[in-house]
């Protein structure tokens, strides 16, 4: 027997559209092989009407399509504008028509009930509002007004002027009788459901002289927009539901089995744990439109998404909605990069951020995801020389190694740095990636004094102790500024005595500042790297003061008087002002990201994403 399955019989009416789903075992071969829909002839052949390879018969031109859903093991044949000529025996199948991988389908198109004379047709989107107008004559002005719905063969009362409301319409229907001058009553139904579709009859009066008017209500379900995005990339759902729901709670949900739609995020503060750290719901405009950005796309993110508006912040019957079918392409152009980076308190991390290598000139950014409210991502640093004030001296964005990757270094880590960070550019918005920084138990590998005071005109030597694990790494000192960290000459002073159980491969590398000037004040980093790949760093703040006594300064670890978590700044330390974003394209859909970067840091808890792709602070 054939493994293909579908409906044996399909019954429809003229003018209707039909979607026929055929199911196949989703093996690798089946997913990629040709899918077809053919009509069986009297002599046993089967003439192709449409196939997945793009063929469409002239009989189906402009009214049919075939869509394959390989991840589900289904393909769907949509046929519109059915006529009785479409009645017949068909096959849906895989491969070649004459082979056995097919299923027989009988399609019967009947003439249909047709609309009664004088029927007004109302076509309205799901979740919206319809007003059915019902005229009547003067003799029925004082008589009962009513609206019936034809269910099968029987009219069922929906609402009447004596106060009756059918339970299926409770809370979303009203009957309005116009002023005495107008011989018209109207029935307003809002939060329209698919089940509201059908034929209605309005009536004024109950006897043989009653006035009647027929109405045909068609409720349109939104067709899902097909969205294809790369694994590890990003997707933005733009949701415009109209000004009438501007003040109603918004949501994005993902359809699971049956008719359940699990909330991914909503404006009431709910967020699915699987999206922690990688989702933003951007503030809505006055017209009620909003957008949702999801980064770090995973295979399991594929599926059908709905955005909508409802006071509960979740999908209910009658919610106005928009739909998308998200496909996640596993043959991604976005390279793998660690989704978790670990560092120790007082230590550092170096994060590699991928970007579209065709956009090497784009501005690079790094922001901190905050879960409060609907999620926001205040910028911390960019490649144009802006650094958020609280991060001066301990955060740098480097264009290296280049060719599709930039590096962000954050040192002087504290538990408050744990959290989710986004790498992004002002170019390709699909290349947004997420990394989680975790603060783990341990000691920093590099040892430097906590803070140092230099004397004007004298010489200052600052030590940095590198353990033997970094023997093969290049060791450097640099002076931090808001555009990066400029390399400085340093001296290798032989093995360090700062490490227990560490042999001759440990190193003490010193930074020497001759004839100190005011310009030497600032942050200095020592660090390790291999080629263009950066490892751990440690930061020292050098303050400069007036000469008190002659001589040079040689700072040792013992003289350090600041804990790794502290940053000792003199009162004259200059804070860089908040930088305005120049490029208006940046975050066109997420103003919150750009507008809120000058707000104070809040406390952040680390959330374990359960990722297996982890990276230590000093590894590549």
């Amino acid at each position: 027997k054939s493994p293909i399955f579908g409906p044996e019989e399909v019954n429809s009416v003229e003018g209707n559209s039909v979607s026929i789903t055929c199911y196949y075992p989703p093996t690798s071969v089946n997913r990629h092989t040709r899918k077809y829909w053919c009509r069986q002839g009297a002599r046993g052949g089967c003439i192709t009407l449409i196939s997945s390879e793009g063929y469409v018969s002239s009989k189906y031109a402009g009214r049919a399509n075939l869509t394959n859903f390989p991840e589900n093991g289904t393909f769907v044949v949509n046929i519109a504008q059915l006529s009785q000529d479409d009645s017949g025996r068909y096959k849906c199948g895989l491969g070649i028509n004459s082979r056995g991988l097919s299923f027989d389908v009988s399609l019967e198109v009947s003439q249909g009930p047709g609309l009664l004379n004088d029927t007004k047709v109302y076509t309205v989107d799901l979740g919206r509002t319809v007003t059915i107008n019902c005229p009547f004559k003067t003799e029925n002005a004082q008589k009962r007004k009513s609206l019936y719905k034809q269910i099968g063969l029987y009219p069922v009362l929906v609402i009447d002027s004596s106060g009756y409301v059918n339970p299926n319409y409770t809370g979303r229907i009203r009957l309005d009788i116009q002023g005495t001058g107008q011989l018209l009553f109207s029935v307003v139904i809002n939060q329209l459901r698919l089940s509201d579709a059908g034929q209605y009859l309005c009536q004024a009066g109950d006897d043989s002289n009653s006035n009647k008017k027929n109405a045909d209500l068609q409720v349109l379900k939104p067709e899902p927009e097909l969205v294809y995005e790369d694994l590890r990339g990003s997707v933005t759902f733009h949701c415009a539901l109209g000004p009438e729901v501007a003040n109603v709670a918004k949501f994005l949900c993902r359809q699971s089995s049956g008719e359940n739609c699990d909330v991914v995020v909503n404006t009431l503060g709910k967020r699915a744990p699987a999206f922690e750290g990688r989702i933003l719901l951007n503030p809505q405009d006055k017209d009620g439109s909003f957008s949702v950005v999801i980064t770090g796309l995973r295979k399991e993110d594929a599926g059908r998404y709905l955005c909508g508006a409802h006071s509960d912040g979740q999908l209910q019957e009658g919610s106005p909605i928009q739909a998308w079918q998200l496909f996640v392409n596993e043959e991604s152009t976005i390279p793998r990069s660690p989704t978790v980076v670990k560092g120790v308190a007082g230590g550092s991390v170096a994060v590699l951020c991928p970007y579209n290598r065709k956009e090497s000139k784009s501005i690079k950014y790094w922001c901190l995801w905050e879960g409060a409210q609907n999620g926001r991502c205040p910028l911390l640093v960019d490649s144009e020389g802006w650094v958020k004030a609280q991060y001066e001296g301990r955060l740098s964005l480097l264009e290296e190694p280049g060719n599709g990757t930039f590096t962000v270094i954050l040192n002087q880590l504290t538990s408050r740095d744990a959290g989710f960070y986004w790498c992004l550019t002002n170019g390709d918005t699909l290349w947004r990636t997420t990394v989680e920084i975790k603060i783990i138990e341990g000691e920093p590998n590099l040892k430097v004094p906590g803070n140092v005071t230099a004397v004007l005109g004298e010489t200052l030597k600052v030590p940095c102790h590198f353990p033997c694990k970094f023997s093969s790494y290049e060791k450097y000192w640099c002076k931090w500024n808001n555009t990066g960290c400029q390399a400085l000459p340093s001296q290798d002073e032989g093995p360090s005595k700062a490490f227990v159980n560490c042999d001759e491969n440990s190193r003490l590398v010193s930074l020497t500042l001759n004839l100190v000037t005011r310009a030497d004040e600032g942050w200095y980093w020592c660090g390790v790297k291999q080629g263009h790949f950066y490892g751990e760093t440690a930061a020292v703040y050098v303050a400069v003061e007036e000469r008190k006594a002659a001589g040079s300064r040689d700072v040792s670890l013992a003289k350090a008087d600041a804990a790794p978590d502290e940053k000792v700044l003199d009162s004259g330390f200059r804070e860089i002002e908040n930088k305005a974003i120049q490029d208006p394209r940046l975050f066109a859909e997420e103003k919150a990201v750009a507008d809120t970067r000058d707000q104070a840091d809040g406390s952040r808890a680390s959330v374990d994403s359960g990722s297996s792709e982890e990276q230590g602070g000093s590894s590549r």
């Epitope: 399955f5 019954n11 209707n16 199911y23 049956g258 008719e259």
Partner: nanobody, 126 residues
């Protein structure tokens, strides 16, 4: 709340016929699926047949091993579904469940159906 009530199950001789009936109440939507599954002692629940109404069209699905013997049909108001079973054999012995659901995609998957009846026992003796 949707409620499904099955009836018609009984003991029947091999080769005999039987009509099962399922009456639904509370189905307020126009698009849904309604059909039959069965579960023999010690076996998984398996798909038998389903009718699905969607956007003005009706779709009929049957399991391969009941084709030519079992027929599924419905009343005009779509709230009653019948399963006519002919040429019954002992392998058809099972509890037959009526199931209904909105947005049913994979009709053969029990998990796609939201509502279930209590079941009616069909015993086919040889």
């Amino acid at each position: 709340e949707v409620q499904l009530v099955e009836s018609g199950g009984r003991l029947v001789q091999a080769g005999g016929s039987l009509r099962l009936s399922c009456a639904a109440s509370g189905l307020t939507r126009s698009d849904y699926a309604m059909g039959w599954f069965r579960q023999a002692p010690g076996k998984e629940r398996e798909f038998v047949a389903t009718l699905k109404w969607s956007e003005g069209s009706r779709f009929m699905y049957r399991a391969e091993d009941v084709k030519g013997r079992f027929t599924i049909s419905s009343g005009a108001a779509k709230t009653t579904v019948w399963l006519d079973m002919d040429a019954l054999n002992p392998e058809d012995t099972a509890v037959y469940y009526c199931a209904a659901g909105f947005n049913v995609g994979f009709v053969r998957r029990a998990s796609e159906y939201n509502f279930w009846g209590q079941g009616t026992l069909v015993t086919v003796s040889s």
